[in-house]
Structure formats: C-alpha cells, structure tokens
C-alpha cells in the first residue's frame, strides 16, 4: 500500500550531457499527454542520480514551472533541453510513499538501497549528544530512498549501520560509514514513545488551531533553541492580540506543526520562518498539558 | 531474454473475423507500449495498432479504425488484435512489437516473428 | 499524416562499399526517426534510434545522422550480411515507415 507525495527538485546540468533524465508518456512525440511523463530512465552518476530524489517511475508535474499534463512529449523534452542551457532544472515530482506498518516505539531493522554516489536523503544529528547516547535522525530529505521506505521520520534513534554499533561512535564517523555503504544499508533503529507527536501522552491533549490575520499580528512569542528536538512552545501572549482572544492558546503550550509542516526535528528559527511566511491563515497544531483548564 | 510469439493467422473469407495474439516473456509486459505493425506480400511495413502498457490508450491507423480492436492482458503476457470486417488488402505478415520510448525517440526494439493472415474467398 | 520517402528505392554495392540512404519527412519530425533492417522471411530488427544513436549490439559501421526532414543512414564498409532491405520510421506523429530500401550485391 502506498500513498502519494511531491516534492521540488533542483538539479544543475550542461548543454551537453544535459541532466541524466528521461521521461516517457504517449506513444508519439505530439501526442497531447493525457497523465503526466514518467521517469522512465536515470543515467549513472548523472545529476538526476547523484541527487538522490529521483526514481524510475516518478510523475513529473511540472518543469521550471510548466506543467507537464495536457501538453506533449516533444514539449516536455524542449523544456528539459532549454533548461540544460540555463544549466538548471527545476522539477515538482510526484512519488509513491510506502504505508508502513511501523510501532509508535520499540527497535526494529530499515533496509535502504544504495549507491556509492547517492545519498540516502538522512540527516544525523548528535544533539546535546551525552557520550553513550545515541545518534538521532533530525531530517529525512523528501523524495529521497530513506524517506520512501515510509518507516523513518526524523527523531528516531539511529543505533547502527550494517551491524556496525554507533553507541560511541562520533557523528562525522556514522556520516562517513553511511556514505560508503553500497548496494543495501542496514539499519538499527530505536523509536521511543516522546518522538510520537500523534501519541497523546498522559495528561495531554493536541488540537488544531486557525487564525486569520486580516493583516495584523499572530500576538504570540515563541520559544525554543537550535537544538533540532527541544520543544517549540508559546512564551508570550500579546494582550487582547489575536491569539489571545481565541482562548484556545496559552503561554506554556507546546507548537507541533505550523500549516501542518511538522516542527518536529526543527529548530526555533525554522519554526520562526515557518511563522513569517505563513500567509493569511494561519493552522497552528497545539499540544497542551491538561493540569490546567483548557 | 525478450520474445515475442504470434499465433492466430490463417484463411478467413473476406467480411470475416479472426484474432491474432501475442504471448510476450523476458521483460515486465506492464511497463511497455506494445504494436501491431503488418507487410503485406511482396511491400513495405505497416503500422497498424498500439496500447499503452496499462492498456489504458489504444491507437490505430485510419485503414483500419473501427474494424480493428488492439487489448492487452497484462496478468497473461499476452497482447490481441482483433480483426472484424476482414478485407483482401488486410491480407499480411502480422507482426507483434515491443514499442519504447529511449533518448527522444519511440522505436520498435524488439519484434515476433509473425504470423500470416490471408483474407480471400 | 506525415510522409516518409526513402531514396534510392534499391541499390547495388560491393562488400567493403561505403552505401548511404536517404529518408525525407514531408514535415519536421525533430530526431523522432528510427532506421531498421530486414532480411527476407525475418522480422526486421532495430539499428538506429533517435536519428543517430546506435541500437545495442548493432555493428559500429552503421551510423545514422540528420534531424528535422532530411535523415542519412550510412554503412561505412559493406559486409556480407548487410544486404537486406532498410526503413525508415518516424514517432513524431503516430508512427509512419518509409517505403524501404533494397541493398543488393552488385
């Protein structure tokens, strides 16, 4: 079972090798594509391969922008040529996403497929790191192989690679380990029950919040650190502002996603730029501890 | 390795019908666009039907729009014609082709080794 | 529906020739042409797809180049086995062949 997803990728190429890509759809060149092109073909170490978010089968929407749907094969591969001179390609690529049935905690076993020249699209963090502790992924690129396994989401710990244990072993040491990895990765991973945002812990609710600007202020202060997995919480209300007025937000409250982007695995400051950039509406999803009124 | 085998030609009276098939293996039959492509005795090749891979499109020349009906059972491997209102001038090697789209170009890489229809009373 | 003629419509050569065939679209079909091969009571096989790129496992002596109407398949020095009849194939449009070439031994 798998579900859909999109995303954005940037590759850069020249005239002459172009970007590694191949798209199919139709069965001639003119023919008005009624589904979007396919990838149907990924060059070895081509920019299309070595950016690790791409794979045969993938839909390709838009190109630089255009959409691809209703127009033809011919025009697709014009697009591509003529973004080969300007040597960049912007791509928005719809994927398959497995449905893993995955526990919210325990340890299990993640095999990723993998090339020398690929990434895997995970990024490790050693936050706070206490000797002993483990690695912690802090960000799976989207599109990439790790991320379409559907079982890694950032705040798992990550305790080996290919039997290799990571208990002391320095984060640049785990990054060079899984860069030379070839063919499949194994690895050990270790989800615990606090990296669940979904899991309504004890004494604890989440909820969704809107707020519509109409121009003015959120009138609220948050707080955090640049440390990937410390909470985001609301320090600051400003008085009758329109946070406030909603009664549903409180200094103290916990900030899990803004616009339903995950603050999990992100710092303050993305959690701030997520806030500045958020349009009109504003959905900000809540996790509130119940020892005080709602 | 690819083949492809065609079966189902023979004599039919004109007006007749008849229904060729052709049992695909060594590659994922659902991934390709596949072709019926035709020469009549003695002339050149002829294109004459295609399908898309989840057979969701079909394409066909105008000679024999409306008579012809190309399908494709993916769970068999097996690609179909069928032939309807069958004229002299149907008369033909029938050949079955794999049809790809590589490197800006559509092309028939890999063809059955036909089988011979005859229209004629 | 776009046109595809082929010239000569036959030829005689020797083994060791350099022969070159010539395909026209009546209308521009960018690289869209494939050239194939086929001997008498055979199917025909694939050589050149996309105007000049060689089909996997086909001899080096054939080369195809052109783009737009006029397309050139050449046979840089003529083998035994060559002499067969060849065509041309667009996919700009829904697929159309030309009426093939006939390569004979002299």
């Known amino acids: 079972i798998v579900h859909t997803e999109t995303t954005e990728v940037v590759l850069c190429g020249d005239p002459l090798s172009g970007f590694g890509l191949q798209l199919q759809g139709g069965i001639f060149a003119t023919e008005t594509l009624s589904s979007p092109p396919l990838v149907c073909f990924i060059e070895p170490d081509s920019p299309a391969e070595r950016c690790g978010l791409l794979q045969v089968g993938d839909r390709v929407l838009s190109i630089n922008g255009i959409a691809t749907e209703d127009g033809t094969m011919e025009e697709a591969n014009q697009l591509l040529r003529d973004a080969a001179l300007a040597h960049k390609v912007v791509l928005e690529v719809e994927f398959d996403v497995a449905e893993s049935v995955i526990p919210s905690s325990g340890t299990f076993h993640v095999k990723l497929p993998k090339k020398r020249s690929v990434e895997l699209g995970i990024t490790i963090s050693s936050a706070s790191r206490k000797r002993g502790e483990p690695l912690i992924i802090s960000d799976i690129k989207k599109g990439s192989v790790a991320h379409r396994t559907g079982t890694l989401e950032p705040g798992d710990k990550l305790l080996a690679i290919d039997n290799i244990r990571l208990d002391n072993c320095p984060m640049e040491d785990a990054v060079q380990i899984l860069r030379q990895c070839e063919d499949l990765v194994k690895l050990k991973i270790r989800k615990d029950e606090d990296n669940s945002d979904e899991l309504e812990t004890t004494g604890a609710v989440s909820y969704t919040v809107e707020l519509k600007r109409y121009g003015g202020p959120l009138g609220i202060t948050i707080s955090g650190t640049e440390e990937p997995f410390d909470p985001i919480v609301i320090s600051g209300l400003t008085k009758r502002g329109l946070a406030e007025r909603t009664g549903a937000i409180h200094v103290g409250d916990r900030i899990l996603a803004i616009n339903n982007v995950s603050l999990k695995g992100r710092p303050l400051s993305e959690a701030i730029h997520l806030l500045q950039v958020a349009g009109e509406t504003v959905t900000l999803k809540i996790k509130k501890q119940l020892d005080r009124p709602l | 390795e690819v083949q492809l085998l065609e079966s189902g030609g023979g004599l039919v009276q004109p007006g007749g019908s008849l229904r060729l098939s052709c049992a695909a293996s060594?590659?994922?039959?659902?991934?390709?666009?596949m072709s019926w492509v035709r020469q009549a005795p003695g002339k050149g090749l002829e294109w004459v039907s295609a399908?898309?891979?989840?057979?969701?499109?079909?394409y066909y020349a105008d000679s024999v729009k409306g008579r012809f009906t190309i399908s494709r059972d993916n769970s068999k491997n097996t690609l179909y014609l069928q032939m309807n209102s069958l004229r002299a001038e149907d008369t033909a090697v029938y050949y079955c082709?794999?049809?790809?789209?590589?490197?800006?170009?559509?092309?028939?890489?890999?063809w059955g080794q036909g089988t011979l229809v005859t229209v004629s009373s | 529906d776009i046109q595809m003629t082929q010239s000569p419509s036959s030829l005689s050569a020797s083994v060791g020739d350099r022969v070159t065939i010539t395909c026209r679209a009546s209308q521009s079909i960018s690289s869209y042409l494939n050239w194939y091969q086929q001997k008498p009571g055979k199917a025909p096989k694939l050589l050149i797809y996309?105007?000049?790129s060689l089909q996997s496992g086909v001899p080096s002596r054939f080369s195809g180049s052109g783009s737009g109407t006029d397309f050139t398949l050449t046979i840089s020095s003529l083998q035994p086995e060559d002499f067969a009849t060849y065509y041309c194939?667009?996919?700009?449009?829904?697929?159309?062949f030309g009426q093939g070439t006939k390569l004979e031994i002299k």
């Open positions: 399908i898309s891979g989840s057979g969701g499109s079909t």
């Open positions: 060594g590659f994922t039959f659902s991934s390709y666009a």
């Open positions: 082709a794999r049809y790809v789209y590589y490197s800006y170009s559509y092309s028939f890489d890999y």
């Open positions: 194939q667009q996919s700009y449009y829904l697929p159309t």
């Open positions: 996309a105007a000049s």
